[in-house]
């Protein structure tokens, strides 16, 4: 087979300068990038600006409060999470513009690409720890009366972030920057190389232990306590659980066309046609993921909202409200009763 | 038909630069890029680097970015490298080649005859 | 750099045999665009290499088609289905994906 049958291919105007026409492909299509690309452009600037923004006010609200309160300490190390991630967006963005060239260097490769997944693994592993909470102040109030405490909250938080991390090192450890002959190009990725088993098997941790098996005990561990809530007319408020239900719920949606991608890339032919459009997606399906670094703070404000009727209060007391709420009778009039039952609500504040 | 054709056998001694040649006819020297390629006595083939005529941009293995020095002169259609603070390792024979491909200049299709550098005192 | 591995190093041969010359590369050659840029080159005694495979499997013009390419990703492998005379010399494989280019160490051909 001969495709050589041409007479002048003049590659000149691939470079003449370092970095190339590096907006040049080389199928020679136009400089424009595709639409998939221009979407997450999109979006990661709007998670950049709300994420930045609303997490940094979280924070600052909740850190406050979170030396007593509870609620705060979760919601605290969900929107530090959050922030970090949204940290390293401008230079995703970048990228992104430059084509997926990446000018940043190996340690930049490593690092900013696995905060995402160091987010991922750290707010699931927190909204699981959330939820073991919210079980226990529903099926074990007595026991939270004893032992729930904020010494615990952090412990629990410093065993999520542990764990967070020690998930992510296989991304970390196999992130490289290879760099293209032509047209030149310098690429920021994981390269299992040798090791299909390897990237298979990251791949299906990732998906479980980050995505199917939270997804199955957080829906049976709000099942039971919305049985229950919603079986007692005493309970006043679910404002918490309302919140903490659509943080998870959005946790999944934005999550699963990442999951998708990645499981099927890891099965896939790197030359495959099927594997070439997923790649061309990957920056489309890690924006979307990227959204739940800037969904929380909305969803609190939202929730804010909804239980003030308008937006009276100033930002950061809605926020407060929504965030500091214990799950507890409290003597200040910015807390208000919960899912726990009666008998629960009967205990000190923690 | 298409021809590259090196400059002669060269000795030089150690410290000092010499330049070889590489002339190129028939195609249009300006349209395809020109690699050079090490290959020490019996032992495998080693990229120096390419340089595209039309615009004297050059990209070099980082072991030779001090070493090579690549140039190309489009009245007369001939490529050159320039060695430079030579020692007994830089005995080899230096090819030129052409690259091509159709999505991009990926092969090289025609290669000089080699010019052989010895490096004595 | 890329580490392109040949195997073996010297293959002994009678004329009609078959053989076929391994070349494992240390990272991944799938280039971003889909293809992979790994090529064949023969290098008989005196001359320079020319260029037979390229692009894992295409015979370049003229190639005779006794020589096939094959594998993906990091493992190659060159095919002669029946050895000739003027099949004799060195073997090399080489990659254009990434920067440095780089060549096996050769795989010389010689009559057994």
């Known amino acids: 087979m001969n495709s050589f049958n041409y007479t002048t291919p003049d590659y000149g105007h691939y470079d003449d300068k370092d970095t190339l026409d590096l907006n040049t492909p080389v199928d020679k299509t136009s400089n424009t990038l595709r639409v998939p690309d221009i979407l997450a452009l999109v979006i990661f600037a709007v998670v950049f600006l709300v994420g930045v923004l609303g997490n940094a006010l979280v924070v600052w609200v909740t850190a406050f409060e979170a030396k007593r309160t509870i609620n705060a300490i979760w919601f605290l190390n969900l929107a530090v999470a959050d922030f970090l991630s949204c940290l390293a967006l401008p230079i995703l963005f970048t990228s992104i513009v430059q084509h997926h060239h990446w000018p940043f260097g190996g340690a930049a490769c490593s690092i900013l690409p696995s905060l995402i997944l160091l987010n991922m693994y750290a707010s699931i592993l927190l909204l699981a720890t959330i939820s073991a909470d919210r079980f226990l102040l529903v099926f074990k109030p007595i026991w939270c009366q004893n032992f729930r405490g904020a010494g615990l909250a952090w412990i629990a938080c410093a065993v999520a972030w542990g764990l967070a991390l020690l998930l992510t090192i296989p991304s970390f450890l196999y992130r490289v920057v290879r760099e293209e002959y032509f047209p030149p190009k310098v690429l920021c990725g994981v390269d299992y190389s040798h090791d299909k088993r390897r990237e298979r098997a990251v791949a299906i941790v990732r998906l479980v232990l980050g995505f199917l098996w939270p997804l199955l005990t957080l829906t049976i561990c709000y099942t039971f306590i919305l049985l229950r809530t919603w079986s007692r007319r005493a309970t006043r408020s679910t404002k918490t659980l309302k919140v903490v239900v659509a943080v998870v719920a959005s946790f999944f949606i934005f999550w699963l066309p990442y999951q998708v991608t990645g499981i099927m890339m890891s099965f896939l032919e790197p030359s495959s046609p099927t594997f070439l459009l997923l790649n061309k997606l990957d920056s489309l399906c890690v924006s979307f993921a990227y959204i739940n670094c800037c969904i929380n703070p909305i969803i609190y404000v939202v929730a804010g909202q909804g239980f003030q009727g308008r937006l009276r209060k100033s930002l950061p007391s809605l926020l407060r409200n929504v965030l500091t709420e214990e799950s507890v009778v409290r003597e200040s009039k910015s807390f208000t009763r919960s899912t726990v039952d009666t008998m629960a609500q009967k205990t000190q504040a923690v | 038909q298409v021809q590259l054709q090196q400059s002669g056998a060269d000795l030089a001694k150690p410290g000092a630069s010499v330049k070889l040649s590489c002339k190129a006819s028939?195609?249009?020297?300006?349209?395809?890029?020109i690699h050079w390629v090490k290959q020490r006595p019996g032992q495998g083939l080693e990229w120096i680097g390419y340089?595209?005529?039309?615009?004297?941009?050059?990209k070099y293995n980082q072991k030779f970015k001090d070493k090579a020095t690549l140039t190309a002169d489009r009245s007369s259609s001939t490529a050159y490298m320039q060695l430079s603070s030579l020692t007994y390792e830089d005995y080899a024979v230096y090819y030129c080649?052409?690259?091509?491909?159709?999505?991009?200049?990926?092969?090289?299709?025609?290669w000089g005859q080699g010019t052989t550098l010895t490096v004595s005192s | 750099d890329v580490v392109m591995t040949q195997t073996p190093l010297s293959l002994p041969v009678s004329l009609g045999d078959q053989v076929s010359i391994s070349c494992r590369s240390s990272?991944?050659?799938?280039?971003?665009?889909?293809?992979?840029?790994l090529q064949w080159y023969l290098q008989k005694p005196g001359q320079s290499p020319k260029l037979l495979i390229y692009?894992?499997?295409n015979r370049f013009s003229g190639v005779p088609d006794r020589f096939s390419g094959s594998g993906s990703g990091t493992d190659f492998t060159l095919k002669i289905s029946r050895v000739e005379a003027e099949d004799l010399g060195v073997y090399f494989c080489?990659?254009?994906?990434?920067?440095?280019?780089?060549f096996g160490a050769g795989t010389k051909l010689e009559l057994r």
């Open positions: 080649a052409r690259v091509t491909g159709t999505e991009g200049p990926y092969y090289f299709d025609y």
């Open positions: 028939g195609y249009t020297f300006t349209s395809y890029w």
């Open positions: 340089i595209n005529p039309r615009g004297d941009y050059t």
């Open positions: 990272q991944s050659l799938v280039h971003s665009n889909g293809n992979t840029y």
């Open positions: 692009k894992v499997s």
């Open positions: 080489s990659q254009s994906t990434l920067v440095p280019l780089t």
